[in-house]
């Protein structure tokens, strides 16, 4: 058992970062941080549980942006973030640090929290070592922090697996002389199997070699990620050393304490009942002090390990630990074919042309304030304003010169002429009509409709 400790030194715009603070036009706000620890160095889904533990910081001082001033480093919460771990320290781990904004003052429709930045580091770290410093960038923001893992007595060692115990104070030497003052004495570490990696292996019984997360092999020398058999499942094959197909990861339900198992690619995921936690729901006695609520969830109850905590999730998250993102757009809040965007802290609709409003509920007055040039007239409707242009002009606003005959309106080889009052088609012999669309019958009578009086086949026909 032990504690992972994280100290945030600063959070602010990085070199060349955004000059504006994240608080612009939002009124007073304050920051807080969430830390999540996952075992191993493998790339894990963002929503996978923080199996090693998680914690929330206190809220930082209230901050109000100074208009036009560049954003300084933002005021931080006091104190360390501490994540207790109950089992061996795995040595290799993923560290996820989220910077959250809590909005104060007038809330306009959305929740009180929004995620400003999230950094993920995959690290090797021995327990008991010095503070490790890091600088990470997330977008335009820069986070400076230090971290360490330390064991809590009686555990000691790089994995917190060796136990210390006080020397007995009751044994006295000959002559009943008083004992020496009480002092701590570690048990001699068990003698591990010869060749067991000092860096990646440990033992609790003499002659064994147990591997830290991410390492395998009889002496813990083989990184898991280099195995050519990774992803196959089932028992080891004695001939190849590779895994062969076998039972699924949820067979036998690896989830303890009533957790339900679901398969994920090459692994499984446990959904734990309230009060239980961890990769296999094996951790109980979690309190609000352990920061079990993710994504800005508010923890209530659970002051001691015997009373269950409850996470009140912010909009957009659900699950006993607020670990699952809700598809809020599935409620289809956007009208008139608008596209729903889940921005995390709120939903926004991207409206189709011709619609506006937070939910695209308003029809735009397409012609309002939008003039058509060169004598064109604006036509409402159809989702976007449209100009009906005067002869010789085209384009969205009738600003482009156009060849009125470019559309080739005259059928059957008719010749097009631009006339001041419209287009005129001079039809080829045998055709008539405004667009030369009607063949003339051999007896001089056209197929429907009848030729207007005064026009003979071959005469120019006016295009309305």
């Amino acid at each position: 058992a032990g504690v992972f400790e994280l100290q945030i030194h600063s959070f602010g715009p990085g070199p060349g970062g955004a000059p504006r603070s994240p608080y612009s036009a939002r009124g007073p706000c304050r920051l807080f941080f969430r830390v999540c620890l996952k075992p191993g160095l493998s790339e894990e889904a963002a929503e996978s549980p923080c199996a090693l533990g998680a914690a929330l910081s206190a809220r930082g001082p209230v901050y109000t942006e100074q208009p036009e001033a560049p954003a300084p480093d933002l005021p931080l919460p006091n104190g360390l973030l501490q994540v207790p771990f109950r089992d061996a320290w795995p040595g290799t781990f993923s560290l996820i640090i989220e910077t959250w904004r809590e909005e104060l003052g007038d809330q306009i429709g959305g929740p009180a929290w929004s995620l400003l930045a999230r950094v993920t580091r995959r690290r090797r770290l021995a327990a008991g070592g010095p503070w490790a410093g890091d600088i990470q960038r997330a977008g335009a923001w820069e986070l400076r922090f230090s971290y360490r893992a330390r064991c809590e007595l009686p555990a000691v060692g790089t994995a917190c697996t060796r136990l210390c115990r006080p020397r007995s104070a009751s044994r006295c030497g000959p002559g009943l002389r008083p004992c020496a003052p009480l002092e701590d004495e570690c048990e001699a570490p068990p003698v591990c199997r010869a060749g067991c990696s000092l860096e990646h292996g440990f033992c609790e019984q003499p002659g064994e070699c147990r591997c830290l997360e991410g390492w395998t092999g009889p002496l813990c020398m083989v990184p898991v990620s280099t195995s050519s058999c990774l992803g196959l499942r089932g028992p080891s094959s004695t001939t190849t050393g590779c895994l062969v197909p076998g039972p699924g990861p949820c067979d036998g339900n690896p989830c303890a304490n009533g957790g339900s198992c679901s398969e994920t690619p090459g692994s499984f995921e446990c959904t734990c009942p309230r009060g239980f936690y961890g990769l296999r729901c094996e951790v109980s006695g979690v309190t609000c002090a352990d920061g079990p609520c993710f994504n800005g969830g508010l923890c209530v109850g659970g002051a001691d390990p015997d009373s269950a905590y409850i996470c009140h999730c912010p909009p957009g998250f659900q699950g006993s630990n607020c670990e699952k993102r809700v598809d809020r757009c599935s409620l289809q809040p956007c009208r008139n074919g608008g596209l729903c965007l889940d921005l995390g802290h709120a939903l926004r609709c991207r409206c189709r042309a011709g619609f506006a409003g937070p939910r695209c509920e308003h029809d735009l007055n397409d012609c309002a304030g939008r003039a058509c040039a060169n004598g064109g007239t604006c036509v409402e409707g159809g989702g976007a304003h449209r100009c009906s242009c005067a002869l010789g002009f085209g384009g969205r606003d009738c600003r482009e010169r156009a060849d009125p005959c470019a559309a080739r309106p005259c059928a059957h080889g008719g010749r097009c002429y631009a006339h001041f009052s419209g287009l005129v088609c001079a039809c080829a012999p045998g055709y008539m009509g405004a667009r030369c669309e009607f063949p003339v019958h051999p007896d001089g009578v056209s197929a429907l409709p009848a030729a207007p009086p005064g026009l003979r086949p071959g005469d120019p026909q006016r295009y309305p």
Partner: antibody, heavy 120, light 107 residues
Framework: EVQLVQSGAEVKKPGASVKVSCKAS????????MHWVRQAPGQSLEWMGL????????SYAQKFQGRVTLTVDTSISTAYMELSRLRSDDTAVYYC?????????????WGQGTLVTVSS | DIQMTQSPSSLSASVGDRVTITCKAS??????IAWYQQKPGKSPKALIY???YRYSGVPSRFSGSGSGTDFTLTISSLQPEDVATYFC?????????FGQGTKVEIK
Amino acid sequence: EVQLVQSGAEVKKPGASVKVSCKASGFTFTDYYMHWVRQAPGQSLEWMGLVYPYNGDISYAQKFQGRVTLTVDTSISTAYMELSRLRSDDTAVYYCARQGNYVNNAIDYWGQGTLVTVSS
Amino acid sequence: DIQMTQSPSSLSASVGDRVTITCKASQNVGNIIAWYQQKPGKSPKALIYLASYRYSGVPSRFSGSGSGTDFTLTISSLQPEDVATYFCQQYSDSPYTFGQGTKVEIK
């Protein structure tokens, strides 16, 4: 602090036009829809239309179509409402109000109102 | 257009009383309604959005409920400063429409 400050009271003759201004401060003007709502003496509220300063989109209530013109000047964070061909039943307090552009947002802040009296 | 019908049009109650105002929409508006308080000679003030969410700074004695077509604004313990006219408004569909108002007085 969010503020919407409207121009002063107006007295107009029937057939004339009136233009009311609404100066916004304390928030990013282009991030909010600006609505105009009127209230005749002793009556309820009546929505007239909205304008989105971000891109100039405009929507009018059918009843006011052709008589109302909504405009904005983003350089001075000001919205305008012009009502033409005034009649005596246009006598009312005219309010500007803002609404955020997220799905949940309702109209949340209102100007102090501008009384327009139409009388011959 | 969606009609919003408020009732009662006026009411008189004593300080400390529980006051309930109802609003009925002519068609389903989900929970996309807001409630406003308007004191004499003043502009409206937003109290509730999404039918039941209080704006910050609004006293907890004000609460909203309902969805679909039937909505309620409740003042759990009427205070002298609550004397005002209360309006419901749907902002689900264009044009936005308001109830005719409920005038609340102290007995």
